[in-house]
Every structure is written in C-alpha cells, then in structure tokens.
C-alpha cells in the first residue's frame, strides 16, 4: 500500500505521458488522477513504466473501482493485464471480441495463464455459448483451448461453431470429448458430399461410433492409418476384414507396420485367419 | 533372398501400350505389396500405385489413374503393369518395389520404356 | 497431396565429414498414436535402382551402416552422414508414406570431392 501524500507543486500530470516516468512511486499516487488515468489507458502502453510503476497504477484503478473495472478500461489495459490477479478479472464483465483479442495478444506465445483462463471463462460464460467467432479467435491463440475444456464445458459448443475448428485444435482432445464433438460435427457438415464430409469429419471421428464408420466404408474414403489408430477401440473392433478394408483403401497395408499397436493389435486378434490372409500382409490373427 | 526381376528395356511406338513384368522370388508373394514407381531421366521419383497381390486389389495416384493398370499373377508370382496410351512424357524408368510395410523396402532393377517413332 | 521440400539439392563433401541433408513435409507425417512418422529415406547410386536406408524416419533398415542417421519428427526431416565414405556417391530421397499418393522429395545429390 503506498502512503497518502500530497502532491508537491507543479507536478500534478495534466495527462498521461513519458514525463510521468520519472515519478516515483508515492509521486504517481499523489499525482496521477485516477480518472484521468482511466479514460487515458490506451496511452499507459506506450509509456515503458517499471513493473514498481505498474503497481500503482493498478493501485489506482482498483480504488477507482473497486467492484471491477469498466470494458472501456479493461479493452486498453494492455501491458498492466499481466499484472491483474484471477480475482480482479472475476469482478469484470468483458462482452466485446475486441476487448477479448487485446487481451490475448498482450499474453500472445505464452502458456495459457491462471488470468487468461479466467478471463476467457467470464467470457464465454457471459456468452452463454461458445460461438463460431470466439472459438475462431481463441484457437487463433491457443491452438489446444478446445481441448482443455471438460466435456460438460463442450456440450455448450453449438454446432455452428464447429466450422472454426482445425485439425490441429483437436491434437490433444480425448476421446470422451471427442465423444461430445463428434454428433455436432456430423450435424454441422451433414449436408456436405461424400469427399468433402470426409475431409471436414476425419478430425472427429475418435468420437464416431462403428456404424458411422460402418457406412464410411462404404463411399471410397480412403482412411490414413494415423487418424484409423485414432479411433474408439471399441468402435473398431467389430468391423469386418471386408470393413477395414475398404475404409482405409490403399493405408490398410500399413496395419503391417503398426500391427503392435492399439487398436490395430486388438482388431487382428478379433479376426478370422482366413480373412486377414486376404489382406496380403502376412498378419498373424 | 528376396530378388524383384524386371526386363531392362521396353521399346515403343507412341500410342502404343506396354505391359511391365516384375518377377518375385524369395519370399512369399501374397504377404507383401507391390508398388509401381516411375523415373524420368535425371527427375525424381514419381508414386504410380500399390497392388494387393493376395486380392488383386490395386489403388492408383489420381495422375496415373487412365494411364496404368496394376495386375498379379499369384501363380507365378509376377506383378504387372499396363501403361497404354503412351507419349514421350511415359519414356521413364519404371520400378517395381516391394513393401515392407509402408515403405519400399526391395526395388527391382526398373526397366527403361522408350517411346519413339 | 503431401510437398516434400528436399535441401540442398546438391552437395560436395569430402572423405570423413558429416553431413546433413533437409526434408520438410507440407503436413505432419507423424501418427500421435504410435510415435512414428511416416517418414523413410533412399539412397539411390549412380546407374542403380534406390534403396532404402531409413523408415518411420529414424529406423535403420537392417545392413545398412550405422553412419547413417534419420532424425526429425512432424514436418521436418534430416538425414545425416557421420562420416562420409567414397561409395556415399549418389542421390538421397526422402519419401511420406502417411497419406496417399506417397509423394517424394526431389531428392539430394552428394558428390564426393
């Protein structure tokens, strides 16, 4: 806490500029008006104050409200956002995709921070869902926030936004919120053709259950093994040699060479010697 | 040991067809798959298509898919490939290949298809 | 399909240098399941047909000398020469077998001074 003290003359600031960095801390208190400082906030970002400096200001802004700042405050806060603590953002209400962005660019290549997930949290909860746009932006910074939702959290996820997705957003789901994604990515690009559906679905399918895996055998998709091995075990283990075959098209000769592995290693154990021979891969059933 | 045959040299007339053998021998025919490979003079290498040879079932690069036709013989343990049509863009060196999984693990000494007049 | 981008095209190296050649896919070869990247490297010499050196990107294939090393994992790729012998003469390429069509790169001349 710093210590009320007036201030000396002639060093009241008239606005927020490079001379306020040579202010000590107690003339920053004493000089700054709080009011001032917050309808000129877009300005504190181009002024390289100490983190000391930072403080105050801060200081400042918390007694000028003390129930939780203004969009209009918060949207310019720049640099001073790294130095807010997860219970001031939980007194905000940040309603703009603008105000959103600002923030995340100042904490741009850093892991997400105990701030930055608070704040995204007010922010999708204020919401109510997680829109196309705001999940546009938030993979646009965190390529794995899909994945670090719950799937009770995913469930709020309209189907609509599901276009926003990209493959690598899902690199690190699991399969029970692959389980959540699947049946609104089927819903999302339900009225797209056979190829196209495919190349939209694929990043799903580790939700997908065996007869929609069933039915996609049958229309030439031409599966990789990398997304094949992503699938449900149990998704997979009742398809037929037949089945495995036409959905992975030329890829099934790799189950060769990832025979040791799940699922592919429990899929071969369920099948009959005579058909996996007619695979032409010498697998051992 | 594992040995892939192909004759040395195919010469033909442009619109013309060929038909490439690949003779297997060292291993058991049906448990590996065969692939096609082309090389034109001093370019890379260009993946034409991979056969099954226990079903027979053959899949194609979309570029490839008109021009060539992939075919065994279990019988004789002899891989094929019809390449019909053919213009000076198919004088190339083409490769048989056996797999070893994924990747190409044994390659046949290829045979040089000349297209002239 | 799937670029693969091979660098330099062309080297010159002596006798018992190391080297190192680049190839970079335009999408990750590696199956986050099993670990492997669908990755192998050939050397193919003068006159010959190629022959493979290295598969899920840093598996040597059996017979091949231990000087040769594969390293690199998603989308970017090395094969290194320890120590570069007279009969290392030829041209390196690497090809993706994730996702047909399998695709090479447009390979890695080494020329010997």
């Known amino acids: 806490e710093v210590e009320k003290t007036a201030c000396p003359s002639g060093k009241k600031a008239p606005e927020i500029d490079e001379s306020l960095i040579f202010y000590k801390k107690w003339e920053l208190e004493a000089c700054v008006d709080a009011a001032l400082l917050a309808t000129q906030m877009d300005r504190v970002n181009a002024i390289p104050f100490t983190y000391e400096q930072l403080d105050v200001l801060k200081h400042k802004l918390d007694e000028l409200y003390p129930q939780g700042y203004p969009e209009s405050v918060i949207q310019h806060l720049g640099y001073l956002f790294l130095k807010m603590s997860p219970e001031d953002i939980r007194k905000w209400n940040v309603t703009s995709l603008e105000t959103l962005k600002a923030l995340l660019e100042v904490n741009k290549g850093h892991e997400m921070s105990p701030q930055v997930a608070t704040l995204i949290d007010r922010f999708v909860k204020g919401r109510g869902q997680l829109d196309k746009d705001t999940l546009d932006t938030l993979t646009a910074f965190y390529p794995g926030y899909l994945c670090s939702l719950s799937p009770e959290e995913l469930s709020s996820v309209p189907p609509s936004s599901i276009w926003a997705v990209r493959p690598q957003d899902l690199d690190t789901c699991d399969p029970r919120q692959l389980d959540v994604l699947y049946p609104k990515a089927r819903l999302a690009f339900q009225n797209m053709n056979g190829s196209e559906y495919f190349v939209k679905i694929q990043s799903f399918l580790g939700g997908a259950p065996t007869e929609d895996l069933k039915a996609l055998s049958q229309q030439n998709v031409s599966m990789d093994l990398a997304t094949f091995m992503k699938l449900r075990t149990d998704a997979v283990l009742p398809l037929t040699v037949a089945e495995v075959q036409k959905l992975l098209g030329p890829h099934v000769e790799g189950l060769k060479a990832e025979e040791r592995h799940r699922p592919v290693r429990d899929w071969i154990l369920r099948q009959r010697q005579d058909d996996l021979d007619t695979l032409g891969l010498g697998l051992q059933g | 040991q594992v040995q892939l045959q192909q004759p040395g040299t195919e010469l033909v007339k442009p619109g013309a067809s060929v038909k490439l053998s690949c003779k297997a021998s060292?291993?058991?025919?049906?448990?590996?798959?065969m692939h096609w490979v082309k090389q034109r003079p001093g370019q890379g290498l260009e993946w034409i298509g991979n056969?099954?040879?226990?079903?027979?079932?053959?899949y194609y690069n979309e570029r490839f898919m008109s021009k060539a036709k992939m075919t065994v013989d279990k019988s004789s343990s002899t891989a094929y490939m019809q390449l019909s049509s053919l213009t000076s863009e198919d004088s190339a060196v083409y490769y048989c290949?056996?797999?070893?999984?994924?990747?190409?693990?044994?390659w046949g000494p290829g045979t040089l298809v000349t297209v002239s007049a | 399909d799937i670029v693969m981008t091979q660098s330099p095209s062309s080297l010159a190296m002596s006798v018992g240098q190391k080297v190192t050649m680049s190839c970079k896919s335009s999408q990750t070869l590696l199956n986050s399941v099993s670990q492997n990247n669908y990755l192998a490297w050939y050397q193919q010499k003068p006159g010959q047909s190629p022959t493979l050196l290295v598969y899920?990107?840093?598996t040597r294939e059996s017979g091949v000398p231990d000087r040769f090393i594969g390293g690199g994992s998603g989308t970017d790729f090395t094969l290194t020469i320890s120590s570069v012998q007279a009969e290392d003469l030829a041209d390196y390429f690497c090809?993706?077998?994730?996702?047909?069509?399998?695709?090479f790169g447009g390979g890695t001349n080494l020329e010997i001074k």
């Open positions: 056969i099954n040879p226990s079903s027979g079932d053959s």
């Open positions: 899920f990107a840093s």
């Open positions: 090809q993706q077998h994730y996702r047909t069509p399998y695709t």
């Open positions: 060292g291993y058991t025919f049906t448990n590996y798959w």
């Open positions: 290949a056996r797999s070893g999984g994924l990747w190409l693990a044994f």
